[in-house]
């Protein structure tokens, strides 16, 4: 019925407005409604103008060009001609009364189906239902996958590709680890993957300035070290360095009036040559203080070495040896004076004897037939050596003696000449001054070591060798190497060290084999004015130790392996060091700082005398230890 109506309307239009010209009223009669008439009539007039004024040619060039008036007019009422809908997006066009309706294909919208629907942004179907990538296309969309994934058959979901299984050699020597959408070539900690060589390469952390002072890089890692010999230790962050701090302050006050006799480990402390009128005779007066039992106080000789006199200490008593053209004598006498107290000593050449007095009381009188030293050039020329003698004298002594003497002299008067000139020289040299107060013991100032040669082999024992050590210590700093055995190849097969504990105001004792700690005694309060007693025994099978708190035999899985390392070293040759380490690599031991404080050492039943060391740093005091610094009311 509708189409019939359309045909009728078309016929009327042909008759009324094409074959004849129609006015608006007549057109109204054709359409029988205003909207269509109002729409039609202006367009009708355009058609008429086009074909009446000869603009046909120009009209043909337009998109809505018609071949003639008929087709121009006939097309006016059809809203779908020319097509108003977007060609890509419409499905159909329905003509309406002065209007049209575009029906859109799926994926399009808008009055003319000109707008693409973005299915990827559809809130009711998030991401278009795609699991990974949603690609919007004109009128449609499709799902895709990220690199390293493949699309499933539902064309929406993605599945990870396992590159490690697909290409087993993809990472070369590194470990391939599959991760969603990708893979990683993994290296152990301390290594970095090299894409070119497809291998793991060691990271040189040392080149990245990870450490404050010294850095040792090794495959897969690095270790920071601090120069213990300069008084530093590794901080808790294991990277920065901090000063090894004093935990027990000592009274290190010195006086220039006190001449320190042990300032040189090997050699004379002070040498004097007198050229006095020939009426002079040898004399020496001085106050003397020591805990040492043996050593040379002074040695005097004539200018031509033909006559000499030695004033020494043996077994804590004064000993005099003398030799000249008339006689050769040795005498020991008096009380023991190595008591740490000041003792007044005088040695005076009289006409027929040499008188030795202690505290102004005669303890020895040595007869002599003539003058001790022969005058020459009208002068008595005498050379005096403190705390030692020239090397060649050693073979001439009546009885050999260890010349090293840790002691002090004050108020000296040689050859009745007072201390003039000498006192002033001593005043300038700080290291030659003596401590005002000392106690019995050996003092390690944290700046050097002493070396001993000790044979640890025990032929009678099945173990072959053993190290039994007793330490009496009173540390002044909480970190330092107390004892170390060092091999010829610069390794440290055994060391006993002190380190500041993580718990405040206490120290740990470390026993180490090479750079491995085999045992740690934790949190001992060693920085006190009382000495601490430590003992340990080690052989190729066992390690026993006793501290103020406990006695125990140590055993753990790794110990036997470590003792085997020690056993191998002990079968070769080891040097024994007290107070620190010689020049070994920083990585040779867990601790490399010098020990600072008092320490007495007994090894395999023998009390070590630092005067008997192969070598000793000059600042180590063999038989005197500074007192603990006492806070006074006004300090």
């Amino acid at each position: 019925a509708n189409s019939l109506l359309e045909e009728t309307k078309q016929g009327n239009l042909e008759r009324e407005c094409i074959e004849e010209l129609c006015n608006k009223e007549e057109a109204r009669e054709v359409f029988e409604n205003d909207p269509e008439t109002d729409y039609f009539y202006p367009k009708y007039l355009v058609c008429l103008r086009s074909f009446q004024t000869g603009l046909f040619t120009a009209a043909r060039q337009s998109t809505n060009a018609y071949p003639d008036l008929r087709s121009c007019v006939n097309a006016i009422p059809d809203q779908c001609s020319p097509l108003p809908c977007n060609e890509d997006g419409y499905m159909s066009c329905k003509d309406g009364k002065a209007s049209f309706t575009c029906t859109c294909k799926p994926g399009w919208q808008g009055e003319k189906c000109e707008f693409d629907i973005n299915e990827c942004k559809d809130p009711s179907n998030i991401n278009g239902g795609c699991s990974q990538i949603c690609d919007n296309t004109p009128g449609s969309y499709h799902c895709s996958c990220k690199n390293g994934f493949v699309m499933l058959s539902n064309k929406k979901d993605c599945k990870d590709v396992d590159e490690c299984s697909l290409k087993p050699s993809i990472c070369g020597t590194a470990v391939c680890k599959n991760i969603p959408g990708d893979f990683e070539c993994e290296c152990p900690e301390g290594y970095r993957y090299n894409l070119k060589s497809k291998s793991c390469e060691d990271i040189d952390e040392c080149s990245e300035n990870m450490c404050a002072q010294l850095c040792v890089n090794y495959p897969g890692g690095y270790t920071c070290y601090c120069d213990g010999k300069k008084g530093f230790k590794l901080a808790q962050d294991q990277k920065s360095c901090e000063v090894v701090s004093v935990c027990l302050p000592l009274n290190l006050d010195t006086k220039y009036e006190l001449l320190y006799l042990a300032e040189q480990f090997a050699g004379v402390v002070l040498y004097l040559k007198f050229r006095l009128p020939e009426i002079s005779r040898f004399s020496a007066e001085f106050d003397f203080r020591t805990y040492d039992s043996e050593g040379v106080i002074l040695y005097a000789e004539s200018i031509d070495h033909s006559a000499w006199l030695l004033i020494a200490l043996r077994g804590g008593k004064i000993e005099v040896q003398l030799k000249n053209e008339h006689t050769s004598k040795i005498t020991t006498g008096g009380d023991v004076i190595n008591n740490g107290l000041w003792n007044m000593v005088s040695v005076e050449e009289l006409e027929h004897s040499i008188s030795i007095k202690i505290a102004k009381e005669a303890v020895m009188d040595i007869n002599k037939p003539g003058p001790l030293f022969k005058p020459e050039n009208g002068l008595l020329e005498t050379k005096v050596y403190f705390a030692g003698f020239p090397r060649k004298v050693e073979s001439e002594l009546i009885k050999p003696i260890n010349p090293r003497l840790d002691g002090c002299i004050r108020s000296w008067n040689l050859m009745k000449q007072g201390a003039s000139g000498i006192k002033e020289i001593i005043q300038e040299k700080q290291n030659k001054h003596c401590l005002v107060t000392v106690e019995k013991g050996s003092y390690y100032p944290g700046s050097g070591i002493a070396q001993f040669h000790i044979d640890y082999n025990n032929v009678s024992s099945a173990e072959g060798w053993h190290v039994n050590v007793t330490l009496n210590i009173r540390p002044s700093t909480g970190t330092g190497v107390m004892l170390a055995l060092v091999s010829g190849n610069n390794t440290v097969p055994f060391a006993v060290s002190l380190v500041d504990s993580t718990s405040e105001k206490s120290q740990d004792i470390l026993l180490s084999v090479e750079n491995t700690v085999i045992y740690r005694i934790q949190a001992l309060s060693l920085c006190s004015d009382q000495q601490s007693h430590l003992e340990f025994r080690v052989n190729r099978n066992n390690l026993e130790l006793s501290t103020p708190l406990k006695i125990e035999t140590i055993s753990h899985e790794d110990l036997q392996r470590q003792l085997a390392v020690l056993d191998k070293a002990m079968k070769a040759k080891v040097a024994t060091y007290l107070g620190g380490l010689p020049d070994v690599p920083f990585s040779a031991t867990p601790v490399n700082a010098f020990y600072n404080g008092c320490m007495e050492v007994n090894i395999n039943g023998v009390q070590l005398d630092l005067d008997e060391a192969i070598s000793k740093h000059n600042d180590i005091r063999a038989h005197s230890c500074p007192s603990v610094w006492k806070k006074t009311k006004n300090s």
């Epitope: 004379v268 402390v269 002070l270 040498y271 004097l272 040559k273 007198f274 050229r275 006095l276 009128p277 050039n377 009208g378 002068l379 000449q417 007072g418 003039s420 000139g421 000498i422 002033e424 020289i425 001593i426 040299k429 030659k432």
Partner: antibody, heavy 129, light 107 residues
Framework: EVQVVESGGGLVQPGGSLRLSCAAS????????MSWVRQAPGKGLEWVAN????????YYVDSVKGRFTISRDNAKNSLYLQMNGLRAEDTALYYC??????????????????????WGQGTTVTVSA | DIQMTQSPSSLSASVRDRVTINCRAS??????LNWYQQKPGKAPKLLIY???SLQGGVPSRFSGSGSGTDFTLTISSLQPEDFATYYC?????????FGQGTKVEIK
């Protein structure tokens, strides 16, 4: 007995020359520095020159530099002072003295304390027109 | 050159008096100082070397002290034979230099 005896003094005109000698006995000269010291009439002591044991070093007071020469002959146990271009102000009693390193200390370094411990009786030099 | 200045130039004292003579150096001479005694018509005699050491044979009433630039010669109890002129002399460097002398006269 240890002693030194000076000789060679006398009267000389300004610009003239004299050679003083000092003979040592009782000691070997080669073991000591030696000095010449002068004393103008009524005045104090003035050191003139000294010479090392082996003669390798010589020192003079500014006022005699270039005019006086100190020398020694250890074989003869003698010390000399050659004085040229003499001036009126050089008039004095000239002493020969032994400089002894009475105390030498070695304490990281050498320190020697010298004193003139042997003096002669002097020889008089008069410079006058 | 190091200048040596003595004070006083002369002093009068009696037997058994304590006498002090001062000597000042124009720069530090440490302890390199000697004291001499000279009697009229005689050669000088070394009394003290190294500022305070008594030369052999010299009576113990003579003593010396000081260091650096200021020095003192002390006669603890003046004896008749001590009336003389006293000179200080530095042996720190060359040229050796003497003080101008201090004459000790009988009061």
């Amino acid at each position: 007995e240890v002693q030194v005896v000076e000789s060679g003094g006398g009267l000389v005109q300004p610009g003239g020359s004299l050679r003083l000698s000092c003979a040592a006995s009782g000691f070997t000269l080669n073991s000591f520095w030696m000095s010449w010291v002068r004393q103008a009439p009524g005045k104090g002591l003035e050191w003139v020159a000294n010479i090392k044991e082996d003669g390798s070093e010589k020192y003079y007071v500014d006022s005699v530099k270039g005019r006086f020469t100190i020398s020694r002959d250890n074989a003869k146990n003698s010390l000399y002072l050659q004085m040229n271009g003499l001036r009126a102000e050089d008039t004095a009693l000239y002493y020969c003295a032994r400089e002894t390193d009475i105390l030498t200390a070695y304490y990281s370094d050498y320190y020697s304390y010298y004193g003139m411990d042997v003096w002669g009786q002097g020889t008089t030099v008069t410079v006058s027109a | 050159d190091i200048q040596m200045t003595q004070s006083p130039s002369s002093l009068s004292a009696s037997v058994r008096d304590r006498v002090t003579i001062n000597c000042r150096a124009s720069q530090s001479i440490r302890s390199y100082l000697n004291w001499y005694q000279q009697k009229p018509g005689k050669a000088p005699k070394l009394l003290i070397y190294a500022a305070s050491s008594l030369q052999g044979g010299v009576p113990s009433r003579f003593s010396g002290s000081g260091s650096g630039t200021d020095f003192t010669l002390t006669i603890s109890s003046l004896q008749p034979e001590d009336f003389a002129t006293y000179y200080c002399q530095q042996s720190y460097s060359t040229p050796r230099t003497f003080g101008q002398g201090t004459k000790v006269e009988i009061k």
